[in-house]
Interface confidence: low
């Protein structure tokens, strides 16, 4: 490690004094210090002498001696104060540039260490430092503003108390640059545009960045458009805006528009599509099947997608029957806008009642006319069953009526003993009726079928059961012959209550 003579960490001299700094190392040595006048350098092998015979306040600073050949990179330093009663500060730079959150060193070096107790940092014109300005002072290096912020870009002065007065340094301009996180932020408005030929249109491309140095342009189908640029600064961001105004659009204006912005960090682009149409349009569609089947008591949401330009002038849901003249409650109708030209309308039908089966129509209107989309809602019901004993053409017959939707299937069971429901162990005989007679089958209503079981003689210690089932559920009715006639048993549970 080189050695400096005099072997003191700091040296205090008066202006005009002669100063000699000698550095000795094992090999050749070099001096490094603040740029200042009047120094003479003399090198002789492993020693180097820095001297002046007229020291000034500008010679104040730290002088470092290094040995370039030393693999450990050792160095020695001495700090020189030239205490000038009229010049307490030696300012090494009048402009300091840092990025946000870096420490900013304002290099005003104190020329007299005795003054350290009365130093302060101020903004020019006697303004106080901004609140939360966190700074420290080193007489060797100056003031350091820690984690500098953009707003702290100001002109500063170093102040020292000399003879009861505040003596300021020349001003130091601090420029705190925003750290540019990436390419400029972009917005292109609208995200999609539709116009009828002859209408006016506006497309706005804007870019913003913490730094003013960026470019922005708008292009149509890869052709750059010449548009005047508006510039602004707010919320600590620079903004550049390009506005394309079209008084009367035509088909050649249609196509892809891209907003592109770039800076040193790279490029950002965003696009939108402009459609020009001959006339107004209104299209209704649904992702759902227009024919809906739902079990009674359950809920259903009917959804209609609307694509329209110009915007809708009116819309509503209507119940077209056949059961009642009720209309859907407005509170159950919901509209959501996917984007400017596409909307979704939903009708919520919770806990459906029998009287709510039927046709539901969504109607919408815009300058292009009226459009409607109709859903057909059929309710599913589990079967209801009843059995009676009758004579048909002189023959004793059990007549089973089953009502439900979808159309129920019918099965007859004969079992031993008297029971409300035949179980497997008791079953004596089973008959499937693949084609029961359909008694009624109207749209949106239950289907009622009838099945006949001809019985020559009723066995008194036996039960005859009619079972019906469909995709929703099943129902049954037990018929128990008794000596005085016949006795019927509906199931213990009444399986369906509308």
């Amino acid at each position: 490690i080189p050695v400096i003579e005099p072997s003191v960490p700091e040296l205090v001299v008066k202006p005009g004094a002669t100063v000699t700094l000698r550095c000795v190392g094992n090999g050749s040595v070099e001096w490094d210090g603040p740029p200042s006048p009047h120094w003479t350098l003399y090198s002789d092998g492993s020693s180097s002498i820095l001297s002046t015979n007229n020291a000034t306040f500008q010679n104040t600073g730290t002088y470092r001696c290094t040995e370039p050949g030393d693999p450990l990179g050792g160095s020695a330093a001495i700090h020189l104060y030239v205490k000038d009663p009229a010049r307490p500060w030696n300012v090494l730079a009048q402009e300091v540039v840092v990025f946000e959150d870096q420490d900013a060193l304002l290099p005003c070096l104190l020329t007299d260490p005795v003054l350290e107790a009365g130093v302060s940092l101020v903004r020019v014109r006697g303004r106080p430092l901004m609140r939360h300005t966190n700074y420290s002072f080193s007489p060797w290096h100056g003031f350091t503003i820690h984690r500098a912020k953009f707003i702290q870009s100001q002109d500063y002065q170093c102040s020292a108390l000399m003879g009861g007065r505040k003596v300021m340094s020349i001003s130091i301009r601090l420029k705190v640059q925003k750290v540019i996180p990436g390419p400029p932020a972009l917005t292109l408005v609208p995200a999609e545009l539709v116009r009828i030929r002859g209408e006016a249109a506006q497309i706005v491309c804007s870019a913003s960045s913490v730094d003013v140095n960026f470019d922005v342009f708008l292009q149509h189908n890869n052709t750059k458009l010449a548009i005047p640029q508006q510039s602004d600064f707010h919320n600590n961001r620079y903004q550049k805006v390009l506005t394309l105004n079209l008084d009367q659009v035509d088909f050649q204006h249609a196509g892809n528009y891209s907003c592109v912005a770039s800076n040193v960090q790279g490029k950002h682009s965003t696009s939108m599509f402009f459609r020009v149409v001959e006339s107004a349009y209104l299209n209704l569609s649904s992702e759902q099947n227009l024919i809906q089947e739902v079990t009674v008591g359950e809920g259903l949401n009917l959804k209609v997608m609307v694509e329209a330009y110009p915007g809708l002038q009116g819309f509503n849901w209507t119940y077209l029957g056949p059961f009642s003249d009720h209309q859907p409650e407005p509170k159950l109708a919901n509209a959501t806008t996917k984007d400017t030209y596409r909307h979704t309308f939903t009708l919520s039908l919770p806990r459906l009642k029998p009287s709510e089966a039927g046709r539901y129509s969504f109607l919408a209107r815009n300058p292009g006319g009226w459009r409607a989309l109709t859903f057909e809602l059929t309710l599913r019901y589990p079967p209801e069953v009843s059995v009676i004993w009758t004579f048909i053409n002189g023959s004793g017959t059990l007549l089973c009526a089953a009502s439900g939707y979808p159309q129920p299937n019918v099965t007859w069971l004969q079992c031993s003993g008297h029971t409300d429901r035949c179980d497997e162990a008791q079953v004596l005989q089973v008959w499937d009726d693949p084609y029961p007679e359909v008694l009624s089958q109207e749209p949106f209503h239950k289907v009622t079928v009838q099945s006949l079981l001809t019985v020559e003689t009723l066995e008194h210690n036996q039960t005859y059961e009619c079972r019906a089932h469909n995709s929703v559920g099943s129902g049954s009715w037990a018929f128990i012959p008794i000596s005085a006639g016949a006795h019927t048993h509906p199931p213990d549970e009444f399986l369906f209550t509308p």
Epitope: A117, G118, V119, S120, L121, V122, R125, G126, R127, P128, L129, M130, R131, H132, Y135, S136, F137, L161, G164, R165, K166
Partner: antibody, heavy 125, light 107 residues
Framework: EVTLKESGPALVKPTQTLTLTCTFS??????????VGWIRQPPGKALEWLAN???????YYNPSLKNRLTISKDTSKNQVVLTMTNMDPVDTATYYC??????????????????WGQGTMVTVS | DIQMTQSPSSLSASVGDRVTITCLAS??????LAWYQQKPGKAPKLLIY???SLQDGVPSRFSGSGSGTDYTLTISSLQPEDFATYYC?????????FGGGTKVEIK
């Protein structure tokens, strides 16, 4: 204990010069960062800042009155003096002196009026 | 000069009420703002400095907030001794300027 007390004439004639003295104790105006200021308040109206003087003899005046105001200090007597020339009836007010409390390094030496005198009423008539 | 606009100029409130007084500066004053309380015939008393720092000995029901150009003095629960006139003061830039004052009266 910090105390300040204003003294001066209760009545002055228009065009005359007003001289007010603020005598203080409990602090020294040689202490780094210390200051004393003058403030006035016309009857029923808001406060108006007039002038400041700092430990290092730095002086600041309200520009609307600057040519009429002079502030000075006598640290040996613990006094600050304010003179106001060419007095007018609109200058009728209660005049207060107040201490600007010290802030030690590394915070910049600027603060607010933390201790006030009781005020002295000056009528210009 | 920086103008300080204080509002309201007066208000009526009851003991226990929460009271808010605002000061609007004509330009950024970087939190260099103080709040004072003045009772009739008395000198002003420092309550808050640096916009939000509570002066020693001032009850904690007083608080200051704000930044940039907008600042607020809040009394969380008004006490009988709080009925007075309140002033703000900016010392960001010379000339130092006071607000027009807010008189807090008993409802």
């Amino acid at each position: 204990e910090v105390t300040l007390k204003e003294s001066g004439p209760a009545l002055v004639k228009p065009t005359q010069t007003l001289t007010l003295t603020c005598t203080f104790s409990g602090f020294s105006l040689t202490t780094y960062g210390m200051g004393v200021g003058w403030i006035r308040q016309p009857p029923g109206k808001a406060l108006e800042w007039l002038a400041n003087i700092w430990w290092d003899d730095d002086k600041y005046y309200n520009p609307s009155l600057k040519n009429r105001l002079t502030i000075s200090k006598d640290t040996s007597k613990n006094q600050v003096v304010l003179t106001m020339t060419n007095m007018d009836p609109v200058d009728t007010a209660t005049y207060y002196c107040a201490r600007i409390g010290p802030i030690k390094y590394p915070t910049a030496p600027y603060r607010y009026f933390d201790f006030w005198g009781q005020g002295t009423m000056v009528t210009v008539s | 000069d920086i103008q300080m606009t204080q509002s309201p100029s007066s208000l009526s409130a009851s003991v226990g009420d929460r009271v808010t007084i605002t000061c609007l500066a004509s330009e950024d004053i970087y939190d260099n703002l103080a709040w004072y309380q003045q009772k009739p015939g008395k000198a002003p008393k420092l309550l808050i400095y640096y916009a939000s720092s509570l002066q020693d000995g001032v009850p904690s029901r007083f608080s200051g907030s704000g930044s940039g150009t907008d600042y607020t003095l809040t009394i969380s629960s008004l006490q009988p001794e709080d009925f007075a006139t309140y002033y703000c003061l900016q010392d960001s830039e010379y000339p130092w300027t006071f607000g027009g004052g807010t008189k807090v009266e008993i409802k």
